[in-house]
């Protein structure tokens, strides 16, 4: 039975040209995390493999940095970066856990972080 929950940074906003950290945390399970994939729609942004480290997809290499931890840093943000991002935790023996983050990239400097929330 899958008992874990993913806590994410939730709905967040950031300024155009700035950077943002996408973070997820898996809790309430003893399952071993073998890999975390970061995705945007059908695009794979990055893979963090427990044994092999980070792979950043070539299309994002100039604007995406690994970490901190299992998180992902998006840099040089544009309004086109607005949208849903997903952290996919591949675990053994539980299977797959998915967390969702919505990022809004704003033109002005009024960007503020939203509240944290949980996805069971």
């Amino acid at each position: 039975m899958m008992t874990g929950t993913i806590e994410t940074t939730g709905n967040i906003s950031a300024e155009k040209g700035g950077s943002i950290i996408l973070q997820c945390h898996l809790s309430s399970t003893t399952a071993q995390v073998t890999q975390v994939n970061w995705e945007q729609q059908d695009q794979l942004l990055a893979i963090c493999n427990a044994d092999l480290g980070w792979h950043i997809s070539p299309s994002f290499k100039d604007r995406v940095a690994p970490g901190p931890g299992l998180g992902l840093t998006l840099q040089s943000l544009t309004v086109n970066d607005t949208g849903e991002y997903f952290c996919i935790y591949h675990t053994y023996p539980d299977g797959t856990y998915t967390g969702r983050i919505f990022l809004e990239v704003l033109e002005s400097s009024v960007a503020e972080h939203g509240a944290r929330f949980q996805i069971p």
């Epitope: 073998t34 794979l44 493999n49 427990a50 480290g53 792979h55 997809s57 070539p58 591949h90």
Partner: antibody, heavy 120, light 107 residues
Framework: EVQLQESGPGLVKPSETLSLTCAVS????????WNWIRQPPGKKLEWMGY???????YYNPSLKSRITISRDTSKNQFSLKLSSVTAADTAVYYC??????????????WGQGTTVTVSS | DIVMTQTPLSLSVTPGQPASISCKAS??????VAWYQQKPGQSPQLMIY???YRYTGVPDRFSGSGSGTDFTLKISRVEAEDVGVYYC?????????FGGGTKVEIK
């Protein structure tokens, strides 16, 4: 340039243990990921498992109870042991390098392959 | 495990003509797909990674496309040296898995 060379017996008896070694030149096995991939006659390529730069191993669950991948950093080589073999383990066995950081799970260097037949 | 299904099984192409190989994943693998070429008597060689990026030294007549579950390897103008078997592979999640291969022959 990275070069990989498989060696080991071409004939193994059923129920015995298949043992192969991959000698690596031009690159240290304390970097990247070192893999075994096989291809039974007329069948798909099958990824068997890897040993990482740090010595961690990951095995294909279909082989998990029978497979061991180890390394000897002093000789810059890594090895495959597959126990309790049957005719279904007859295949061409490849050792291969994977540069996860740059290419994800895509294998960029392969050995020439060695044919292993399981027969009494 | 994710199953990768390739079509067609074989392809006979006139030199200078285009060729197209399809690969379908049993679940969404985003862009975590590689393509390999295996010439007769040789080991596989990496051609494409991340669905559409050519590996070092691969001629630009080879191109990869697709995301999600449907992927394509195209050869814009087939040459005699392109004969061999082409394989797709997913690395979205372990165990990494390969397609069954497509044999390209010259007419």
């Amino acid at each position: 340039e990275v070069q990989l060379q498989e060696s080991g017996p071409g004939l193994v008896k059923p129920s015995e243990t298949l043992s192969l070694t991959c000698a690596v030149s031009g690159y240290s096995i304390t970097s990247d990921s070192w893999n075994w991939i096989r291809q039974p006659p007329g069948k798909k390529l099958e990824w068997m498992g890897y040993i990482s730069y740090s010595g961690n191993t990951y095995y294909n669950p279909s082989l998990k109870s029978r497979i061991t991948i180890s390394r000897d950093t002093s000789k810059n080589q890594f090895s495959l042991k597959l126990s309790s073999v049957t005719a279904a383990d007859t295949a061409v066995y490849y050792c291969a390098r994977l540069d996860f950081s740059n290419y994800g799970g895509a294998v960029d260097y392969w050995g020439q392959g060695t044919t292993v037949t399981v027969s009494s | 495990d994710i199953v990768m299904t390739q079509t067609p099984l074989s392809l006979s192409v006139t030199p200078g003509q285009p060729a197209s190989i399809s690969c379908k994943a049993s679940q969404n693998v985003r862009t975590a797909v590689a393509w390999y070429q295996q010439k007769p008597g040789q080991s596989p060689q990496l051609m494409i990674y991340s669905a559409s990026y050519r590996y070092t030294g691969v001629p630009d007549r080879f191109s990869g496309s697709g995301s999600g579950t449907d992927f394509t390897l195209k050869i814009s103008r087939v040459e005699a040296e392109d004969v061999g078997v082409y394989y797709c592979q997913q690395y979205y999640t372990t165990p990494w898995t390969f397609g069954g291969g497509t044999k390209v022959e010259i007419k």
